[in-house]
């Protein structure tokens, strides 16, 4: 086994001066690194585990159904082949693809996570990290497109569809990154006194890095619709003192204060309690962090099935869309753009709209 | 300073239960895994089993499984371990033995209560 | 389970004697090996760990070294402190296992 010289001390244990070469276990069994994590690896079936199990499955069906629709309506209606609704599919696909990766784990946890090789519960931990960043920055790409539109005063950027694709592969460039990092090298193979309680194979300092990275995402995405509504707010209350239609335009702040309340509130609530909890499996040695994880994991899995019902059913044409792809429809005219065509922007990006121009056709 | 501090000695029937206690003090108790060992008069050193605090984790040694049960109270800070079905191959001085790392298990251990006599005897 | 192996079973030496005590592995165990010392109606106590890593506080006149199956523990020039017996012990994962134990003694 190779053997990397180093004479850093062991900071997880002050009291002695450690001058050992740190060794690598790739070829132990994952029992090994469990054991030595603290982290229970069960040996049979409990309530718990089953019903991780069960729900996580139902959870994962859901995920993969909800985003196949999301995909197909706006591939079918070409009323949505606009930036937006490009960012949203791939949102879809990200959120598909975590599906995918909960599935798997789905299939690879409890007892079955001890037939695991080290290489296999990397790809196992690989796929959710991949698929989780891939979901995020989406939602950051979102975050930024509306951002965007409306400081620009558009109802959809005049992005090119190159540069579309451009920001899809560097969304998934980035997750594919992020989900490769410990497998090729930030993980605790070959510094086993600093493995993680959470995921035994993950180096604490991985875990305080992904946590961080996350929460900054958040906190960027925050700021950012902060100050969509800001915007919005000072143009509403500008143009209330010149306009007769003072209640459109708080119906219009509500409804834009709804959304945004919605997006980021799924966010905060399906992301935060697991982020928190990764900083306190390495920050806070009294906290029993495993006893709460499957359900953060869980939770945050919610968020992938959350975006399509935040993102998507909020829409009135893409509700139709599914209803037609659903019921087997025909669309009356799903390829040309109609008369009101423009009112297929998203509910944020029309009621932004409304609130600053006095009818929603003035720009494209 | 870190201590472990074991219950006084036990004298009971065969097939009768005890229960030893282990106060630790000194530092945080659910940072750190708790051991047991036993040790039988002029012989070696055997392990029984581990809990881990923080998680309530517990580890047995095979052939200890259905003769020791370890328990752990942390608001008082305390491990306990429950011998049943007590033989006289039980009679031994029993060690609780503290974890030398903290937040992880390195299944060496470098703070050790003073021993728990137990006798069985009818 | 990994069986201990520890040679000799006893030992008597003088003080300012060198003194080797070994240890086998039944397999492969890699650096995680622990040395114990235990006087009479004491508890163990923790000399060495990683093979090689001295416990803070004892003496640099102890020194563990090897790795796999094959460890061992070196005193140089005893102390009267240093007799009794000595145990090792793997740390590899549960369950665990000490060896039979080296009994040191004042020649």
């Known amino acids: 086994m190779a053997a990397i010289s180093t004479s850093i001390p062991v900071i997880s244990q002050p009291q002695f001066t450690a001058m050992n070469e740190p060794q690598c276990f790739y070829n132990e069994s994952i029992a090994f690194f469990y054991n030595r994590s603290g982290k229970h690896l069960a040996t049979e079936w409990n309530t718990v585990s089953k019903l991780v199990m069960g729900l996580g499955i139902t959870v994962c069906i859901f995920i993969m159904l909800a985003n196949l629709l999301v995909m197909v309506a706006i591939y079918v209606n070409r009323r949505f082949h606009f930036p937006i609704y490009y960012l949203m599919a791939n949102l879809a696909a990200a959120d598909f693809f975590a599906g995918l990766a909960y599935f798997y784990l789905m299939f690879n946890t409890g007892p079955n996570t001890r037939r695991l090789t080290v290489s296999t519960w990397l790809l196992r931990q690989g796929l959710i990290d991949t698929s989780l960043t891939a979901s995020v920055a989406n939602l950051l790409a979102i975050a930024i497109e509306r951002h965007i539109t409306v400081f620009r005063m558009q109802l959809h950027t005049r992005m090119s569809n190159r540069r579309v694709v451009v920001v899809i592969v560097v969304i998934w460039t980035m997750a594919i990154v992020m989900g490769a990092i410990p497998s090729v090298g930030w993980n605790c193979i070959c510094d086993i006194e600093n493995c993680s309680n959470m995921a035994p194979l993950y180096s604490d300092s991985y875990l305080v890095f992904w946590a961080i990275f996350n929460l900054v995402t958040f906190v960027v995405m925050v700021v950012l619709y902060a100050h969509i509504f800001g915007y919005v707010r000072q143009r509403t209350m500008r143009m209330s003192r010149h306009s007769s239609g003072p209640r459109r335009n708080r119906d219009t702040m509500m409804s834009l204060l709804k959304t945004v309340v919605i997006v980021l509130g799924a966010f905060i609530i399906c992301w935060t309690p697991g982020l928190v909890l990764l900083l306190l499996d390495v920050c806070c040695p009294q906290c029993d962090v495993l006893a709460y994880e499957k359900f953060f994991l869980l939770l945050a899995e919610f968020n992938s099935a959350m975006n399509p019902i935040i993102y998507s059913y909020r829409d009135k044409e893409m509700s139709a869309t599914f209803r037609q792809i659903l019921c087997c429809q025909r669309s009356e005219n799903p390829t040309g753009p109609t008369e009101g065509s423009d009112r297929s922007a998203s509910s944020l990006n029309h009621t932004i709209l409304a609130g600053v121009h006095s009818n929603d056709h003035s720009v494209v | 300073q870190v201590q472990l501090q074991q219950s006084g000695a036990e004298l009971a029937r065969p097939g009768a239960s005890v229960k030893l206690s282990c106060k630790a003090s000194g530092y945080t108790f659910t940072s750190y895994g708790i051991s047991w060992v036993k040790q039988r008069t002029g012989q070696g050193l055997e392990w029984i089993g581990e809990?881990?605090?923080?998680?309530?984790?517990?580890y047995y040694n095979e052939k200890f499984k259905g003769k020791a049960t370890l328990t752990a109270d942390k608001s008082s800070s305390t491990a306990y371990m429950e011998l049943r079905s007590l033989t006289s191959e039980d009679s031994a001085v029993y060690f609780c033995?503290?974890?030398?790392?903290?937040?992880?298990?390195?299944?060496?251990?470098?703070?050790w209560g003073t021993g728990t006599t137990v006798t069985v005897s009818s | 389970d990994i069986h201990m192996t520890q040679s000799p079973a006893s030992l008597s030496a003088s003080v300012g004697e060198t003194v080797t005590i070994t240890c086998r592995a039944s397999?492969?165990?890699?650096?995680?090996l622990a040395w114990y010392q235990q006087k009479q109606g004491k508890s163990p106590h923790l000399v060495v760990y990683n093979a090689k890593t001295l416990t803070e506080g004892v003496p640099s006149r102890f020194s563990g070294s090897g790795s796999g199956t094959h460890f061992s523990l070196k005193i140089n020039s005893l102390q009267p402190e240093d007799f009794g017996i000595y145990y090792c012990?793997?740390?590899?994962?549960?369950?665990?296992?000490f060896g039979a134990g080296t009994k040191l003694e004042l020649k």
């Open positions: 809990i881990y605090p923080r998680s309530g984790n517990t």
């Open positions: 012990q793997h740390h590899y994962g549960p369950p665990l296992t």
């Open positions: 033995a503290r974890e030398s790392i903290s937040r992880r298990l390195g299944w060496n251990f470098d703070v």
């Open positions: 397999e492969n165990i890699y650096s995680f």
